[in-house]
Interface confidence: low
Amino acid sequence: QSGPLPKPSLQALPSSLVPLEKPVTLRCQGPPGVDLYRLEKLSSSRYQDQAVLFIPAMKRSLAGRYRCSYQNGSLWSLPSDQLELVATGVFAKPSLSAQPGPAVSSGGDVTLQCQTRYGFDQFALYKEGDPAPYKNPERWYRASFPIITVTAAHSGTYRCYSFSSRDPYLWSAPSDPLELVVTGT
């Protein structure tokens, strides 16, 4: 084969958002017949030559960016996309509210507001079932997530987290869930 080996995938199971003291497994997946895997934590000297890292109890020190690669013969693959492993529950949960309210007519507007009592400048909003968050660096203790022209697809359960840009992988506990109901669809 000419050129670099294709990059592997790196995933965290069951999730890359891991409550403190809960287990998580990091799994590097390359093509069949790989000779050697290397899984490393960036900005540290921590690495292992195995495809799977099982963390029985999440700690603050394990939060951060990870990547992996593999070796076939003398060739190393391109590195995987970075995985951000986040420790949650480090700080008290924020509150999540909907303005003007959690019931909104289809086509209307609603703003989800994540608010914390402490000095955080970063917020992440998750919709249950969606793996990717809406991230919003706004005011240091409150972020607003406007949803313009609401549709039925916006219905669902939302949670938010707060954290500091100083320690971007140490997050609060999740807010209590907020159920957004879209009416008139």
């Epitope: 509150s95 509210s97 303005q99 608010q115 009592r117 240091w140 500091s164």
Partner: antibody, heavy 114, light 106 residues
């Protein structure tokens, strides 16, 4: 224009209770928090507590047992209640918007004396 | 609760000069510090938040810096209208004011 206006009783008897109202305009109490701060004569500023947009409250730990903050969003009013007053509660009481308190009222003077 | 130790408690400087006030927190406050100017008969005015961010309309003569537990606030090219008491405020965990610094002009 954002404005906050405090109104209070002026004079309160020792061991009595204090009620102060902060009436705001130019912003909604559902979207912003309001703090209470006081300044005793010749002394510095002291944060008392805060009510958030969602109605939750935080209090300075040493005053928590004597302090209550509430609000009426529809009237754009925030209320400070303090009981078991002592002479050292004599101060100018201010309300201020949000974190880190970008708008303030002019304050209302409270004297605790018999 | 986080304690804020502000110094000096008073200072005197000449017009056109420069003054610096410091605040030390009892624990790391992650840059969540604000600075206020307070003149008699008025409510305090927010000058700086998040260590160094100037409020709109505040002259660039005012500045702030710091990290961790140690923070400072400076006024350069001092003007007569800067006579006031200045306070730091931490808002990393609840809120705590420093004791204040009374600024006088020589």
């Amino acid at each position: 224009e954002v404005q906050l206006l405090e109104s209070g009783p002026g004079l309160v008897a020792p061991s009595g209770s204090l009620s102060i109202t902060c009436t705001v305009s130019g912003f909604s109490l559902t979207g912003y928090g309001v703090n209470w701060v006081r300044q005793p004569p010749g002394k510095g500023l002291e944060w008392l507590g805060m009510i958030w947009g969602d109605g939750s409250t935080d209090y300075q730990s040493t005053l928590k047992s004597r302090l209550s903050i509430s609000k009426d969003n529809s009237k754009s009013q925030v209320f400070l209640k303090m009981n078991s007053l002592r002479t050292d509660d004599t101060a100018r009481y201010y309300c201020a918007r949000d974190l880190p308190m970008d708008y303030w009222g002019l304050g209302t003077s409270v004297t605790v004396s018999s | 609760d986080i304690q804020m130790t502000q110094s000096p408690s008073s200072l005197s400087a000449s017009v056109g000069g420069r003054v610096t006030i410091t605040c030390k927190a009892s624990q790391d406050i992650n840059k969540y510090i604000a600075w206020y100017q307070h003149k008699p008969g008025k409510g305090p005015s927010l000058l700086i938040h998040y260590t160094s961010t100037l409020q709109p309309g505040v002259p660039s003569r005012f500045s702030g810096s710091g990290s961790g537990r140690d923070y400072s606030f400076s006024i350069s090219n001092l003007q007569p209208e800067d006579i006031a008491t200045y306070y730091c405020l931490q808002y990393a965990n609840l809120l705590t004011f420093g004791g204040g610094t009374k600024l006088e002009i020589k």
